[in-house]
C-alpha cells in the first residue's frame, strides 16, 4: 500500500501497471478503473476473468507475473487504476493506487502570425504556435536560428524584432507533451517581413 | 535472467535412492512455487509435486507419496527431489520447473532435466 | 485426478497450414488450462497459461481458447521450428496438476 503510482502512456501505445507482492497464497487479485471492476484474477485457481469483454485482448501480464500490461491505449483509458491483493494470511489487503494519463502523438504545429509593423526598416511581430486539436499538456519553445547565436524562447508566443539588411532567421516551433515532440514548417523572416516591407509604416495580420 | 539449472544423470540399482538437485537464479527463490514434473522415456509429463521455498511447504501428488520428498535450501537458492524405494519403471527424466506467480500451476522456467536410470 | 484427454495423438502438416489440438477435461476447470511446446531432448516450454493468455515472447501464431471441459491450441500458419510435441495441462485449484497425453506435430 505505497503512495500512487503516476503513469503516462500514448494512444496506441501500451503501459504497464508495476506489481509485486511477496504473499504466499493470493487468493484473488482485483483490478479496477475509475471504480469499475477489470480484471479479477485468482493464481491457484489458474483463471483471469476480464470483466469487460472488449478488453480481453488488450490485457496481459508480463513473464507470468502480477503485474498488469494494458495495451492499444485510448485517451480514456486515463484515469485512476486499484489493485487490491486478497489473502486470508493478510489482515486487509494489500493495495496500489495508480494515475494513467494517456497522451495524442503531437501532430505538426501550426504557426499564426499576429499584427505585423514595420518601422524604420524593423519588422516586428508575434508567432503564435499552438495545436489544432487542443491537445492536453503541450509545452512550446521556439528555437531561432541564423544569426551568431542560435537563441531559444519559452511559450507558444514568440516576438519578433527583425531589421532588413540583417542576415536572415529562421524561426522553428517545438512542441512537446509527456510522449511525443513535432516541429513546425521553418519560418523565414525575410518572407514574414516581405509583405510589409513597401509600406515602412504598414500593420497587417 | 531466469536459469534452472539440474544435477547430472544418475544410474541406481532397484531399492536404492537419489536426490536430484535444481539451483535457481536470476529471481527470488524463495517467493514462487518450485514443481517437479517426470517424463519416462518416449512417455508424457507427469506431475510430481511442489515446494514453496520461502517457508518448505509442499504439495503431492498422491501416486508420489512416500515415493518423492521435495525440499529447498533458501541459502544456496536450490530445490531437492529424493527418491527412494526405486524400481525399473522410476526411469525417467525428472525436471523442475518454476510456478508462474499469475497462475501458481502455470510453469514458465525449466530445468534441463536429469535423467535417472534404474538398472540392476 | 481431472483427467485431461488431448486429439490427436498425432498429425501430419505443411509449413504455413492451419493446425488445431484439442483437449478434454474430465471435469469443469474453468479456464484453467496451459499449453506446452516441447522438443526431442528438451525441457517443456511454455506458451499458453489460462486458456487463452500467451506467455511474454511466444509468437501471436499461437492461440489458445476454451473454458469449462473443451479447450483448444491453433497455431494459424505452421512454421519450420513448431514441429514439435504440444502438452495441454491443466492448473485448475488444488493439485495434482495433469497433463494430456500429447500431440505431435510431424512435417507431411
Known amino acids: 500500500s505505497g503512495p500512487v503510482k503516476e503513469l503516462v502512456g500514448s494512444v496506441g501505445g501500451a503501459v504497464t501497471f508495476p506489481l509485486k507482492s511477496k504473499v504466499k497464497q493470493v487468493d484473488s487479485i482485483v483490478w479496477t478503473f475509475n471504480t469499475t471492476p477489470l480484471v479479477t484474477i485468482q493464481p491457484e485457481g489458474g483463471t483471469i476473468i476480464v470483466t469487460q469483454n472488449r478488453n480481453r485482448e488488450r490485457v496481459d501480464f508480463p513473464d507470468g507475473g502480477y503485474s498488469l500490461k494494458l495495451s492499444k491505449l485510448k485517451k480514456n483509458d486515463s484515469g485512476i487504476y486499484y489493485v487490491g491483493i486478497y489473502s486470508s494470511s493478510l489482515q486487509q489487503p494489500s493495495t496500489q493506487e495508480y494515475v494513467l494519463h494517456v497522451y495524442e502523438h503531437l501532430s505538426k504545429p501550426k504557426v499564426t502570425m499576429g499584427l505585423q509593423s514595420n518601422k524604420n526598416g524593423t519588422c516586428v511581430t508575434n508567432l503564435t504556435c499552438c495545436m489544432e486539436h487542443g491537445e492536453e499538456d503541450v509545452i512550446y519553445t521556439w528555437k531561432a536560428l541564423g544569426q551568431a547565436a542560435n537563441e531559444s524562447h519559452n511559450g507558444s508566443i514568440l516576438p519578433i524584432s527583425w531589421r532588413w539588411g540583417e542576415s536572415d532567421m529562421t524561426f522553428i516551433c517545438v512542441a512537446r507533451n509527456p510522449v511525443s515532440r513535432n516541429f513546425s514548417s521553418p519560418i523565414l523572416a525575410r518572407k514574414l517581413c516581405e509583405g510589409a516591407a513597401d509600406d515602412p509604416d504598414s500593420s497587417m495580420v | 535472467q531466469v536459469q534452472l539449472v539440474q544435477s547430472g544423470a544418475e544410474v541406481k540399482k532397484p531399492g536404492a535412492s537419489v536426490k536430484v538437485s535444481c539451483k535457481a537464479s536470476g529471481y527470488t527463490f524463495s517467493s514462487s512455487w518450485m514443481n517437479w514434473v517426470r517424463q519416462a522415456p518416449g512417455q508424457g509429463l507427469e506431475w510430481i509435486g511442489r515446494i514453496y521455498p520461502g517457508d518448505g511447504d509442499t504439495k503431492y501428488n498422491g501416486k508420489f507419496k512416500g515415493k518423492a520428498t521435495l525440499t529447498a535450501d533458501k541459502s544456496t537458492s536450490t530445490a531437492y527431489m529424493e527418491l527412494s524405494s526405486l524400481r525399473s519403471e522410476d526411469t525417467a527424466v525428472y525436471y523442475c520447473?518454476?510456478?508462474?506467480?499469475?497462475?501458481?500451476?502455470?510453469?514458465?522456467?525449466w530445468g534441463q532435466g536429469t535423467l535417472v536410470t534404474v538398472s540392476s | 485426478d481431472i483427467q485431461m484427454t488431448q486429439s490427436p495423438s498425432s498429425l501430419s502438416a505443411s509449413v504455413g497450414d492451419r493446425v488445431t489440438i484439442t483437449c478434454k477435461a474430465s471435469?469443469?476447470?474453468?479456464?484453467?488450462v496451459a499449453w506446452y511446446q516441447q522438443k526431442p531432448g528438451k525441457a517443456p516450454k511454455l506458451l499458453i497459461y489460462s486458456a487463452s493468455y500467451r506467455y511474454t515472447g511466444v509468437p501471436s501464431r499461437f492461440t489458445g481458447s476454451g473454458s469449462g471441459t473443451d479447450f483448444t491450441l491453433t497455431i494459424s500458419s505452421l512454421q519450420p521450428e513448431d514441429f514439435a510435441t504440444y502438452y495441454c495441462q491443466q492448473h485448475y485449484s488444488t493439485p495434482p496438476y495433469t497433463f494430456g497425453g500429447g500431440t505431435k506435430v510431424e512435417i507431411k
Open positions: 520447473a518454476r510456478s508462474t506467480m499469475i497462475a501458481t500451476g502455470a510453469m514458465d522456467y
Open positions: 471435469q469443469d476447470v474453468s479456464t484453467a
